[in-house]
């Protein structure tokens, strides 16, 4: 079989949900010494980056200007060292937001509940969409989907203090084109002291894997680069629709 280099890691910088007309940045983390990186969109070549000097950095950033529905979809990347190409990265789903309208999010029985109570979120949007999405702040990869003509229900079942946090919803016009986000709804779940101490509130910063971890080379990094790259590929968690 033809020899290939380990697959790179593709990430969205800051977030994979990009407001229309704003810039998206995707990072492709490959290997020190890579002379070329290619970004592919829906299977076709989209952009090419040739870092100079190539041996000093283990990846590149691809800027995607003026985000719109035509540039939302599935991205992947590959890289080359000499004449040897890598395997293709996992797919990254890039979503355009702030399309058309803004939904309304509400919660029943209310935003303040007791641990064990059943809670349902309702997302309403009057324009033509049938898919709705609910996201918890700091957990933007864990998207819940629900369907409805104008309104969708998101039953949470009996909640625990782990459900505490801020929620937003979107209407979806297709898998990669979402509405403006709703205003956030903060769910407060009260429980006994033991439960509360075990379930701190979620961080409000972006998901930790939505960060570009490109590094400049040092002697030690060079020695560890291949081992580290293989390990990261093995452990990397990736979101799929």
């Amino acid at each position: 079989p033809k020899q290939t280099l380990p697959k790179p890691i593709i990430r969205a910088e800051s977030t994979y949900m990009v407001p229309k007309e704003k810039q998206a940045t995707l990072c492709c983390q490959g290997s020190y010494g890579a002379v070329e990186y290619q970004l592919h969109f829906e299977g076709s070549l989209f952009a090419v980056e040739r870092p100079k000097p190539p041996e000093r950095i283990n990846g590149v950033k691809f800027h995607i200007p003026d985000m719109n529905s035509r540039k939302a979809g599935r991205y992947s990347c590959i890289y080359r060292v000499g004449e040897l190409w890598s395997e293709r990265s996992d797919l990254l789903d890039l979503v355009v937001t702030e399309m058309y309208d803004t939904p309304t999010l509400s919660v029943h029985p209310g935003p303040e509940v007791t641990s064990g109570e059943k809670v349902t979120f309702y997302c309403r949007l009057d324009t033509a969409t049938s898919m709705f999405l609910l996201l918890k702040e700091g957990r933007s990869r864990d998207v819940q989907r629900s369907y409805g003509k104008v309104q969708a229900e998101f039953p949470m079942g009996p909640v625990t203090t782990a459900h505490r946090g801020s929620y937003r919803c979107f209407g979806s016009y297709n898998n990669y084109a979402w509405s403006f986000p709703s205003e956030p709804v903060k769910l407060l779940v009260t429980g006994d002291i033991e439960n509360t101490s075990l379930a701190p509130t979620d961080p409000t910063f972006p998901d930790s894997w939505d960060t570009c971890l490109l590094t400049r080379e040092t002697g030690l990094q060079k020695d560890l680069a291949l081992w580290d790259h293989t390990a990261q590929n093995h452990h990397h968690h990736h979101h799929h629709h």
Epitope: F46, A47, V60, K61, P65, D66, K71
Partner: nanobody, 130 residues
Framework: QVQLVESGGGLVQAGGSLRLLCAAS????????MAWFRQGPGKDREFVAA????????YYADSMKGRFTISRDNAKNTAYLQMNSLRLEDTAVYYC???????????????????????WGQGTQVTVSS
């Protein structure tokens, strides 16, 4: 806002050469990656060549490699496409395009997908005859 105007097209015999020019107005052109695309009769638009804003990085479609050369002169706000060894199948309208000026671009990035480009010229006709 960037306006692009192509020139230099015309009728040429197979095996001949042409040099296309893309004149840009707008202060940001010198910081924008750009490219040439073409659309032949009854065909889809296809990528020809791309160049980074610095001119330090170029990329070509396989069928143009070795025959076409893309370059730019940022001081003159102009990009060029030198086309040699022209073939009948090179007959097309040639368009230059520049990406949107919403981002600071790496000096070595090029874009090969038409969807990356915000600004387009009106095109110049190249006809290759036998």
């Amino acid at each position: 806002q960037v306006q692009l105007v192509e020139s230099g097209g015309g009728l040429v015999q197979a095996g001949g050469s042409l040099r296309l020019l893309c004149a840009a107005s707008g202060r940001t052109f010198s910081r924008l990656p750009m490219a040439w695309f073409r659309q032949g009769p009854g065909k889809d638009r296809e990528f020809v060549a791309a160049i980074s804003w610095s001119g330090g990085s170029t990329y070509y479609a396989d069928s143009m490699k070795g025959r076409f050369t893309i370059s730019r002169d940022n001081a003159k706000n102009t990009a060029y496409l030198q086309m040699n060894s022209l073939r009948l199948e090179d007959t097309a309208v040639y368009y230059c395009a520049a990406v949107g000026d919403s981002a600071p671009y790496s000096a070595t990035i090029v874009y090969t997908d038409a969807r990356a480009y915000a600004y387009w010229g009106q095109g110049t006709q190249v006809t290759v005859s036998s």
